[in-house]
């Protein structure tokens, strides 16, 4: 999917809303300084791209984290700012519910949540230079 | 609007236990705050102590962890710092802080203090 | 234990003037997420310490924009622009990188 004509704004007030304090508390008091930031993102539809990838496939040591609530609040933030982004996930969406697993926290699952973060970090802050 | 307010004995004898509370108002102590210690010798700079996550998981200063314990009590909504084998060299001001995560997960900003108390170690 | 250091200790300025405050630590505190995690604080006389500035240059929420942070890596720095009566106090710069977090030794600014 092509994130370019998204409503960049609109997305970024979900986040700062809903979908942070939701990442947040997946996090669970882990910090994002006990990780390495090892994915990154030039401009906002890049970013969407890898926040997309990030949160809904599976990752070796992290099945699925499609079925948190703040991949819910992605998914539909991305639904309704994002024209044509749902019908795109039809098939996605039911991919995904023949392998549904039980949900565990692995330190993976939350190494990948800390990616997330700086990724919505760099989404919001597109003009703030990488120092 | 979120205070924390310290409480606990002004005067303890050397080789004694230190007992301090910090009582949080305005917020919950359940949210996703570490909730710190800080003390202040007289006259001089700022030393951090320690942390706790209203989960229990704590994090110390290594040059007091052998003589510190920190708790939580959600149900009173306040945290507690134990420090043992106390000495002059542990009379200060101590203040609880709040360090509340950004909306990206960072951490390492005290937001509020306590107004602070004085412990004074003396026999 | 990361260790940083504040020059200059005493720092008499007159109202109106700016002022700069430097912060050394004895390692990077920039991340890889491109932040740097250092904090500054004010400690009023007689109060406890306040927030001013995180993440090296981020302001607190209601300081006011006289206040500015810099740097990057190892080198950071805290301006005022135009130093008013009430920045009286002591100036703690603070890295949140890693636990133990450890504070500067305080610069204590003063009015001519």
């Known amino acids: 999917y092509d994130f370019t004509n998204c409503d960049f704004e609109k997305i970024k007030a979900a986040y700062l809303s809903t979908i942070s304090k939701d990442l947040i508390t997946y996090m669970s008091g882990t910090k994002s300084t006990e990780f390495n930031n090892t994915v990154s993102c030039s401009n906002r539809p890049h970013c969407l791209t890898e926040i997309q990838s990030l949160t809904f496939n599976p990752t070796a040591g992290c099945a699925s984290l499609a079925k948190e609530m703040f991949a819910m609040k992605t998914k539909a933030a991305l639904a309704i700012w994002c024209p044509g982004y749902s019908e795109t996930q039809i098939n996605a969406t039911q991919a995904m519910k023949k392998r549904r697993k039980r949900k565990v926290t692995t330190n993976k699952c939350l190494e990948q949540v800390s990616q997330l973060q700086g990724l919505w970090r760099r989404f919001n802050r597109p003009l703030l230079k990488q120092q | 609007q979120v205070q924390l307010q310290e409480s606990g004995p002004g005067l303890v004898k050397p080789s004694g236990t230190l007992s301090l509370t910090c009582a949080v108002s305005?917020?919950?102590?359940?949210?996703?705050?570490?909730w710190s210690w800080v003390r202040q010798p007289p006259g001089k700079g700022l030393e951090w102590i320690g942390e706790?996550?209203?989960?229990?998981?704590?994090n110390y200063n290594p040059s007091l962890k052998s003589r510190v314990t920190l708790s939580v009590d959600t149900s009173k909504n306040q945290f507690s710092l134990r420090l043992s084998s106390v000495t002059a060299a542990d009379t200060a001001v101590y203040y609880c802080?709040?360090?509340?995560?950004?909306?990206?997960?960072?951490?390492?900003?005290?937001?509020?203090w306590g107004q602070g108390t004085l412990v004074i170690v003396s026999s | 234990d990361i260790v940083m250091t504040q020059s200059p200790l005493s720092l008499p300025v007159t109202p109106g003037e700016p002022a700069s405050i430097s912060c050394r630590s004895s390692?990077?505190?920039?991340?890889?997420?491109?932040?740097?995690?250092l904090d500054w604080y004010l400690q009023k006389p007689g109060q406890s310490p306040q927030l001013l500035i995180c993440?090296?240059?981020d302001r607190a929420s209601g300081v006011p924009d006289r206040f500015s942070g810099s740097g990057s890596g190892t080198d950071f720095t805290l301006k005022i622009s135009r130093v008013e009566a009430e920045d009286v106090g002591v100036y703690y710069c603070?890295?949140?990188?890693?636990?133990?977090?450890?504070f500067g030794q305080g610069t204590k600014l003063e009015i001519k």
């Open positions: 802080a709040r360090d509340a995560p950004s909306d990206y997960g960072d951490y390492g900003f005290f937001d509020h």
């Open positions: 305005g917020d919950s102590i359940s949210n996703y705050n570490w």
């Open positions: 706790i996550y209203h989960s229990g998981r704590t």
């Open positions: 390692q990077s505190l920039l991340h890889s997420n491109g932040y740097n995690y």
């Open positions: 993440l090296g240059s």
């Open positions: 603070m890295q949140a990188l890693q636990t133990p977090y450890t």
